[in-house]
């Protein structure tokens, strides 16, 4: 029985050239998190954080992705092409898989505000 819920930063915006933190949090379960996958909308993986093996950033994103904080992910040097959906997939035992969604909008405007609001998708 999956009792947990994923809280995410929801819909966020950030300015071109800047950076943004993608954050998910799993709550309401005692399940052990064995791995967290960070994916883009096309299911391509940006990074994973395995409980035993640590962080690994996919080669294509090495220059622009930094692990953390926590199980989150920091995207740097944002471009307009970074606009879109991002998913955190929590692999847990014994519950199974939980998935959270974040929508990032990259703005040209210098007044773009980075929303840090948490919400349940």
């Amino acid at each position: 029985m999956m009792t947990g819920t994923i809280e995410t930063t929801g819909n966020i915006s950030a300015k071109k050239g800047g950076s943004v933190i993608l954050q998910c949090h799993l709550s309401s379960t005692m399940a052990q998190v064995t791995q967290v996958n960070w994916e883009q909308h096309d299911h391509s993986l940006l990074a994973i954080r395995n409980a035993e093996l640590g962080w690994h950033i996919y080669p294509a994103f090495k220059d622009r992705v930094a692990p953390g904080p926590g199980l989150g992910l920091t995207l740097q040097s944002l471009t307009m092409n970074d606009t879109g959906e991002y998913f955190c997939t929590y692999h847990t035992y014994p519950d199974g898989t939980y998935r959270g969604r974040i929508f990032l909008e990259v703005l040209e405007s210098s007044v773009a505000e980075h929303s840090a609001r948490f919400q349940i998708p």
Epitope: Q32, T34, Q35, N37, E39, L45, I48, N50, E52, L53, G54, H56, Y58, P59, H91, T92, Y93, P94, D95, G96, T97
Partner: antibody, heavy 119, light 106 residues
């Protein structure tokens, strides 16, 4: 060409240890995980464990904890597996394989190292 | 740990025949991967992420499934397809393989 070159066959006595190697070429070694898989004669596969070459951290199948030790030499792009306290049950072909990070499949396999345990 | 049961264990097919083999998981899994192995050689990644064909795999192969039930299908058997096929999954605490389906040419 992406390749995993494994060391040659081993004939060892019961109770002994053996260390085999897997040299990677044709790709950036630290961009992937390295896995080890056992195939007993005429049987299926058992996953032994996985190594993160960047930090040397490992993840093992519970069954092989204490039996297998995975290590790495980043400078030579080589992964190693040592098996200890060998018995006839350890006679098998051992493969190293390049592991996908997120989905945990193996996209490149070595040719295998045959280990025979016999007195 | 999740047990993968492949069926049939052995099967034979004539050239041009449609072939389907299955892999049943003891608990739900997110993805299934398949490998082809010919006698005396190392396995080759064949289908990954349930339905994606590895580079060089003929398009007569396909993979499908979800939850606990997955399958590999060959739309029209060819001689070079004779081999053993193994399914594999990773879930949060285990990576396991099926015992394999040996496909022979009739």
């Amino acid at each position: 060409e992406v390749q995993l070159q494994q060391s040659g066959p081993e004939l060892v006595k019961p109770g002994a240890s053996v260390k085999m190697s897997c040299k990677a070429s044709g790709f950036t070694f630290t961009d992937y995980f390295m896995d080890w898989v056992k195939q007993s004669r005429g049987a299926s596969f058992e996953w032994i464990g996985r190594l993160n070459p960047n930090n040397g951290r490992t993840s093992y199948n519970q069954k092989f904890k204490g039996k297998a030790t995975l290590t790495v030499d980043k400078s030579s792009s080589t992964a190693y597996m040592e098996l200890n306290s060998l018995t006839s049950e350890d006679s098998a072909v051992y493969y190293c394989a390049r592991g996908d990070l997120g989905r945990w499949y193996f996209d490149v396999w070595g040719a295998g190292t045959t280990v025979t345990v016999s007195s | 740990q999740i047990v993968l049961t492949q069926s049939p264990a052995i099967m034979s097919a004539s050239p041009g025949e449609k072939v389907t083999m299955t892999c049943s998981a003891s608990s739900s899994v997110s993805y299934m991967h398949w490998y082809q192995q010919k006698s005396g050689t190392s396995p080759k990644r064949w289908i990954y992420d349930t339905s994606k064909l590895a580079s060089g795999v003929p398009t007569r192969f396909s993979g499908s499934g979800s939850g606990t039930s997955y399958s590999l299908t060959i739309s029209s058997m060819e001689a070079e397809d004779a081999a053993s096929y193994f399914c594999q999954q990773w879930s949060s605490n285990s990576l396991t393989f099926g015992a394999g389906t040996k496909l022979e040419l009739k």
